[in-house]
């Protein structure tokens, strides 16, 4: 079986302030088992935007029903975008581990730019 790929089909997305931004991500396989997370930025200082497994992310909704059997679409929508949300967002697959899940593969990233709200 082919190794899982993390697909972020847009290199960049531009959204007006106050609107919602949809960031698309899909996996090509259900294996390995483990959650996905969305981060803004890369490296040690990256910011967690969404964790499929746990946490409260009031501005983030998933585009498809993540609990649905065989779901491979992990796209998210972030509401009420502000200039502070600009940056590169990464969809990251983790492999289930004990005691902690282990990062398995990251998407290439989608750069979110924020336009001024139309007057």
């Amino acid at each position: 079986e082919d190794e899982l790929q993390v697909i972020q089909p847009e290199k960049s997305v531009s959204v007006a302030a106050g609107e919602s931004a949809t960031l698309r991500c899909a996996m090509t396989s259900l294996i390995p088992v483990g959650p996905i997370m969305w981060f803004r930025g890369a490296g040690a200082g990256r910011e967690l935007i969404y964790n499929q497994k746990e946490g409260h992310f009031p501005r983030v909704t998933t585009v498809s029903e993540l609990t649905k059997r065989n779901n491979l679409d992990f796209s998210i929508s972030i509401s009420n975008i502000t200039p502070a949300d600009a940056g590169t967002y990464y969809c990251v697959k983790f492999r289930k581990g004990s005691p902690d899940d282990v990062e398995f593969k990251s998407g290439a990233g989608t750069e979110l730019s924020v336009r001024a709200k139309p007057s």
């Epitope: 993390v6 697909i7 899909a26």
Partner: antibody, heavy 121, light 113 residues
Amino acid sequence: QVQLVQSGAEVKKPGSSVKVSCKASGGTFSSYAISWVRQAPGQGLEWMGGIIPIFGTANYAQKFQGRVTITADESTSTAYMELSSLRSEDTAVYYCARQDLGSSHWHFDLWGRGTLVTVSS
Amino acid sequence: DIVMTQSPDSLAVSLGERATINCKSSQSVLFSSNNKNYLAWYQQKPGQPPKLLIYWASTRESGVPDRFSGSGSGTDFTLTISSLQAEDVAVYYCQQAVSDPPTFGGGTKVEIK
């Protein structure tokens, strides 16, 4: 080794439609986008539109919007391009081409051999 | 849409000599997030589909001979064939992939002098 295998040449009347297929032989569509690029006789390359089968969504060049429909069947690893309201200027070789979204380089790394569509009354 | 302009339209070069093709984009094809230029070069021989030679402006596709090289950044790019071989006779196209729709240059026909 993956190949993109296209359907055979077509001769069509003006005003009719044509549907061309592109099958990924020896592989799947899972981490790819499939685009359609046409080349009129002696001319350059023109992108018509593309689809990401894993998402099922297509996007089209403005020039072809409303006249072209691109679809994909993941179960058979086949993409389709249908062009309607054909006119003589649509006579061209139509290529399907693959972008490997997993690699993030976004260029067309694999091409079908092309399907010649001739529009003539 | 980003307009890609190639020059010259055609080029005749002696066997073993250098061939240089230029490509200019109407906007930068540099993607700031990864500092890559989303510019590719293709070779098309008569009756065949295009073949990817170079991507990210200067990265050779697997199996492409090292006499082919790409350079440039931003809006100005060059494809160089360091020592032209008979099998290099073809039309060469540049293409940007930084934004939709992907757009191609008009092509440069390379012939033997």
